[in-house]
Interface confidence: medium
């Protein structure tokens, strides 16, 4: 259907509500650097235009694309030029350049520091005194620190942390409610944007059949039940939805997966018996519901895999014929059989039958050449298993912190050239596997390490991809999606490595450490890890063990010290001249 | 859930033609592999011709090919079996089967296919 005014189109289908906080979070992530006041005004009159073409279609300007109009909207900002440097350039172009060249002005890791909550009384007062606007506020400074976030799945998310004001702030002890509320909430946030980071890089760097691909191997093991036809059809309309989205369409993508939610309700009889208490939710809270649905149980009949894929006489003829057809219905059939393994697996398990029949079908005796590939998979399911287990043993050994420092030294000697606060980031949260995935049972185990490591490796890559620095990160990042993880794994020492210069500057500490938060204690702490190492390389585990033993002990006793900041100046050089003769 | 239904059987003499009918409710019909399959009196189910989903990719059996075709009407969701220079021991029930999900795999295997059809009789005789 054929609209006159796009704009009222989606102000239509959206709601106001809906429209303006899109807008609002639309306008955030292109111009991370402007302040709230700015974009609550751009998206206000935005709003007001957008009702004015609904109410009178023929409207002046109601006829433009969403880009032009968009556009337009951010070339109209005074600070363009001072604020953004070159991105003001992108005003000089026409559509569709002017969308593409704001897109690639989006900056992954702004700098800006990390969201301090005020006094539970003051968020109150100020939540009750305009909730609009302190909602608002909340999208705003989610959606500039994080520019690629899924801006349907934010609107979800303000209405979480609607709630939860609502409720901790009748509460007697309003900090005791909001804390550990607030705390998960931001927990799953975090999680949500590197998802959709992750997505995104998919859709960017490697393409619609990437991502395609992935999302079948998913919602296969999500909906074994449904047919792959079915799975076909909700795969084409949440690649669109997502394309919009990492596109900056949010009004689109915000429309277009409220439309697929309703298919699936409508259609939930073929595509798993799991949906229904979904289905009875408006629509955030529906969507969401369908996106983390638990998984259908396994039809009980499912013929084995070897009829088709290896003994059908026609196996050569199916896959000539289309191949990714034929592929899609292989990750699909072996998907739902597999819900204990990761996507990245089944997505490496369909490239190597793939590569084999490459291989087979351009021989004299195909069926004879690909009879074994089943049995060929076994290595590529060993590995990631493998590591798995290891890796949880370790968590288990040493708890997150320490883990995180294992993973720390591993990945610094993997590559040095990266930048320490990228080191620590991923490092963290690579750490944070294991806490999420170990306690699992053993049939989750692999899925949810996996997929998880592929979602961090993402953010190493897109870190890296700004400054680059590290071939052998360039390697990991670009050569394949599916084998980032296996590639960072693989890499050994960079021997080629040349030793940083020591500066004392970088161990110089100061008493304000004693009083910062557990979280930034370690990340200090980890941060002067990663320098230890980019110093001396080829430091030993148990060297640098007893230093970070000692520089433990020296942070405890000077935080306990009567002065302070004189036990730092004064012990702080020793610490670092005992550091240095204790790894030469 | 699939539901088939064949028509077109009949009696015919050596020589001539019929052409089968197979019409289906499945909204993704046409992304689907339907076959032929036909069963003489105390003989097993044999294969007769299949087509994939998506891309009409057509396979027959060696005792049909060059004699019968199989095509499809997407818009209409019915598969045809059209069938030249009929012979005695083409006499039998004839099948149309479907396999959901397997857009391109047409399958020899009768056990492979969860949806049949209730058959329609052709007979060859003079």
């Known amino acids: 259907e054929a609209y006159k005014s796009e704009i009222a189109h989606r102000y239509n289908d959206l709601g106001e509500e809906h429209f303006r906080g899109l807008v609002l979070v639309a306008f955030s992530q292109y111009l991370q650097q402007c302040p709230f006041e700015d974009h609550v005004k751009l998206a206000k009159e935005v709003t007001e235009f957008a009702k004015a073409c609904a109410a009178e279609e023929s409207g002046a300007n109601c006829d433009k694309s969403l880009h032009t109009l968009f556009g337009d909207k951010l070339c109209t900002v005074a600070s363009l030029r001072d604020k953004y440097g070159d991105m003001a350039d992108c005003c000089e172009k026409q559509e569709p350049d002017r969308n593409e060249c704001f897109l690639a002005h989006k900056d992954d890791n702004p700098g800006f520091p990390p969201l301090v909550a005020p006094e539970p009384d003051a968020l109150c007062a100020a939540f009750q005194d305009n909730e609009q606007l302190f909602l608002g506020k909340y999208l705003y400074e989610i959606a500039r620190r994080h520019p690629y976030f899924y801006a349907p799945e934010l609107l979800y998310y303000a209405q979480q942390y609607k709630g939860v004001f609502a409720e901790c702030c009748q509460a007697a002890d309003k900090a005791a409610c909001l804390g550990p509320k607030i705390e998960a909430l931001r927990e799953k946030v975090l999680l949500s944007s590197a998802k959709e980071r992750f997505k995104c890089a998919s859709l960017q760097k490697f393409g619609d059949r990437a991502f395609k691909a992935w999302s079948v191997a998913r919602l296969s093991q999500r909906f074994p039940k449904a047919d792959f036809a079915e799975i076909s059809k909700v795969v084409t309309d949440l690649t669109k939805v997502h394309k919009e989205c990492c596109h900056g369409d949010l009004l689109e993508c915000a429309d277009d997966r409220a439309d697929l939610a309703k298919y699936m309700c409508e259609n939930q009889d073929s595509i798993s018996t799991k949906l229904k208490e979904c289905c009875d939710k408006p629509v955030l809270e529906k969507s969401q519901c369908l996106a983390e649905v638990e998984r259908d149980e396994l039809p009980g009949d499912l013929p084995s895999l070897a009829a088709d894929f290896v003994e059908d006489k026609e196996v050569c003829k199916n896959y000539q014929e289309a191949k990714d057809v034929f592929l899609g219905t292989f990750l699909y059939e072996y998907a739902r059989r597999h819900p204990e393994y990761s996507v990245s697996l089944l997505l490496r398990l369909a490239k190597e039958y793939e590569a084999t029949l490459e291989k087979c079908c351009a021989t004299d005796d195909p069926p004879t050449c690909y009879a074994k590939v089943l049995d060929e998979f076994k290595p590529l399911v060993d590995e990631p298993q493998n590591l798995v287990k290891t890796n949880c043993e370790l968590f288990e050994k040493l708890g997150e912190y320490g883990f995180q420092n294992a993973l720390l030294v591993r990945y610094t000697k993997k590559a040095p050239q990266v930048s320490t606060p990228t080191l620590v980031e991923v490092s963290r949260k690579l750490g944070k596997v294991g806490t999420k995935c170990c306690k699992k049972p053993e049939s989750e185990r692999m899925s949810c390490a996996e997929d998880f490591l592929s979602v961090v490796l993402n953010r190493l890559c897109v870190l890296h991809e700004k400054t680059p620095v590290s071939e052998r990160v360039t390697k990991c990042c670009s050569e394949s999606l599916v084998n980032r993880r296996p590639c960072f794994s693989g890499l050994e020492v960079d021997e080629t490595y040349v030793p940083k210069e020591f500066n004392a500057e970088t161990f110089t500490f100061h008493a304000d450490l004693c009083t910062l938060p557990e979280a930034e204690k370690q990340v200090k702490k980890q941060t002067a890890l990663v320098e230890l190492l980019k110093h001396k390389p080829k430091a030993t585990d148990e060297q640098l063990k007893t230093v970070m033993g000692d520089f433990g002990a020296f942070v405890e006793k000077c935080c306990a010290a009567e002065n302070k900041e004189g036990c730092f100046s004064e012990e702080g050089p020793k610490l670092v001249a005992a550091a240095q003769a204790a790894l030469v | 859930e699939v539901q088939l239904l064949e028509s077109g059987g009949g009696l015919v003499q050596p020589g001539g033609s019929l052409r089968l009918s197979c019409a289906a409710s499945?909204?993704?019909?046409?992304?689907?592999?339907v076959a032929w399959f036909r069963q003489a009196p105390g003989k097993e189910r044999e294969f007769v011709a299949g087509i994939g989903g998506g891309v009409d990719i057509t396979y027959y059996a060696d005792s049909v090919k060059g004699r019968f075709t199989i095509s499809r009407d997407n818009s209409k969701n019915t598969l045809y079996l059209q069938m030249n220079s009929l012979r005695p021991e083409d006499t039998a029930v004839y099948y149309c089967a479907a396999r959901p999900g397997r857009p391109l795999i047409t399958s020899k295997v009768a056990d492979l296919y969860p949806y049949w059809g209730q058959g329609t009789l052709v007979t060859v005789s003079s």
């Open positions: 499945y909204r993704y019909i046409d992304e689907t592999a």
